[in-house]
């Protein structure tokens, strides 16, 4: 296993609709054809997997149908979007990139993007 540098923004505020996007950029040492991207969430010293996708270079990222993540790739950059976020989902979102094929296997883990989420103000009841 060889180490690889992964860069991501330090902090992002999600939209009022609970959507946060950020770029995860990796310094590919070779010509990988198969890449796996995993988003991990660290909160209160616990790390959980948010979503993961494996893609072939030049193709779209495919997350599971029920995933809260979507993404696109361009060269050594992956543009990740996480949806359905609520204030309780605030935390450090870490991008993990694995170059699966061809060998050698490379692994890179970013420093994390702190995503802050604000629950929208409830709309006041209105009588019509």
């Amino acid at each position: 296993c060889k180490a690889m540098h992964v860069a991501q923004p330090a902090v992002v505020l999600a939209s009022s609709r609970g959507i946060a996007s950020f770029v995860c950029e990796y310094a590919s040492p070779g010509k990988a054809t198969e890449v796996r991207v995993t988003v991990l969430r660290q909160a209160d010293s616990q790390v959980t997997e948010v979503c993961a996708a494996t893609y072939m270079m030049g193709n779209e990222l495919t997350f599971l149908d029920d995933s809260i993540c979507t993404g696109t790739s361009s060269g050594n950059q992956v543009n990740l979007t996480i949806q359905g976020l609520r204030a309780m989902d605030t935390g450090l979102y870490i991008c993990k990139v694995e170059l699966m094929y061809p060998p050698p296997y490379y692994l890179g883990i970013g420093n994390g993007t702190q995503i802050y989420v604000i629950d929208p103000e409830p709309c006041p009841d209105s009588d019509f």
Epitope: P9, A10, V12, A43, G112, Q114, I118
Partner: antibody, heavy 118, light 108 residues
Framework: QVQLVQSGAEVKKPGASVKVSCKAS????????ISWVRQAPGQGLEWMGW????????NYVQKFQGRVTMSTDTSTNTAHMELRSLRSDDTAVYYC???????????WGQGTLVTVSS | EIVMTQSPATLSLSPGERATLSCRAS???????LSWFQQKPGQAPRLLIS???TRATGIPARFSGSGSGTDFTLTISSLQPEDFAVYYC?????????FGQGTKVEIK
């Protein structure tokens, strides 16, 4: 090295607006947030809100909602904070601070004194 | 909103003495999101400690932070003349982010 340099002191009349700027250097501007904090004479630190430079999203303290606008110009690596309908109790030193991973305010501007007086 | 309460409001000590500053939060949160700042008259605040216990770059070893949950402490092991200042704790766990009201460390 990381630096945040703020605009100079301002004297304003009640009801007017003020726009304070904060020029960042020494780091990738879009990868961090910018927070604004004020300090009235002899008082403690009061957080006003912040802007996520990466996407332009903002979050303001309820007390300032509707009266404050925070923005950035990524071409000049500058953040702005505009406060409208100024009152005498808005007299304070206004600081910008860089927001990093885990929300840490790791670097601060030197402060801008805004005096509101008729 | 998480309310941060600092005590005491003023601490009168002599150079060389140990200073213990307390910060209490109205609700529990991860210590990763607790910072301490030092502010001297006419100057901007300066980050001392982040993550409740990690000293910022260039901060002397006499400054240490500890605590978890709702109770956090900043300790200055041996006060130097330049340490007499106001100290603030801050939480950035939940929006809105909040500061304590400050503790002034003054020369006795």
């Amino acid at each position: 090295q990381v630096q945040l340099v703020q605009s100079g002191a301002e004297v304003k009349k009640p009801g007017a607006s003020v726009k304070v700027s904060c020029k960042a250097s020494g780091y990738t501007f879009t990868n961090y947030g910018i927070s604004w904090v004020r300090q009235a004479p002899g008082q403690g630190l009061e957080w006003m809100g912040w802007i996520s430079v990466y996407n332009g999203n903002t979050n303001y303290v309820q007390k300032f909602q509707g009266r404050v606008t925070m923005s950035t110009d990524t071409s000049t690596n500058t953040a702005h904070m505009e406060l409208r309908s100024l009152r005498s109790d808005d007299t304070a030193v206004y600081y910008c601070a860089r927001v990093g991973v885990r929300g840490i305010f790791d670097y601060w501007g030197q402060g801008t004194l805004v005096t509101v007086s008729s | 909103e998480i309310v941060m309460t600092q005590s005491p409001a003023t601490l009168s000590l002599s150079p060389g003495e140990r200073a213990t500053l307390s910060c209490r939060a109205s609700q529990s949160f991860s210590s990763s999101y607790l910072s301490w700042f030092q502010q001297k008259p006419g100057q901007a605040p300066r980050l001392l400690i982040s993550g409740a216990s990690t000293r910022a770059t260039g901060i002397p070893a006499r400054f240490s932070g500890s605590g978890s949950g709702t109770d956090f402490t900043l300790t200055i092991s041996s006060l130097q003349p330049e340490d007499f200042a106001v100290y603030y704790c801050q939480q950035v766990y939940n929006l809105p982010w909040t500061f304590g009201q400050g503790t002034k460390v003054e020369i006795k």
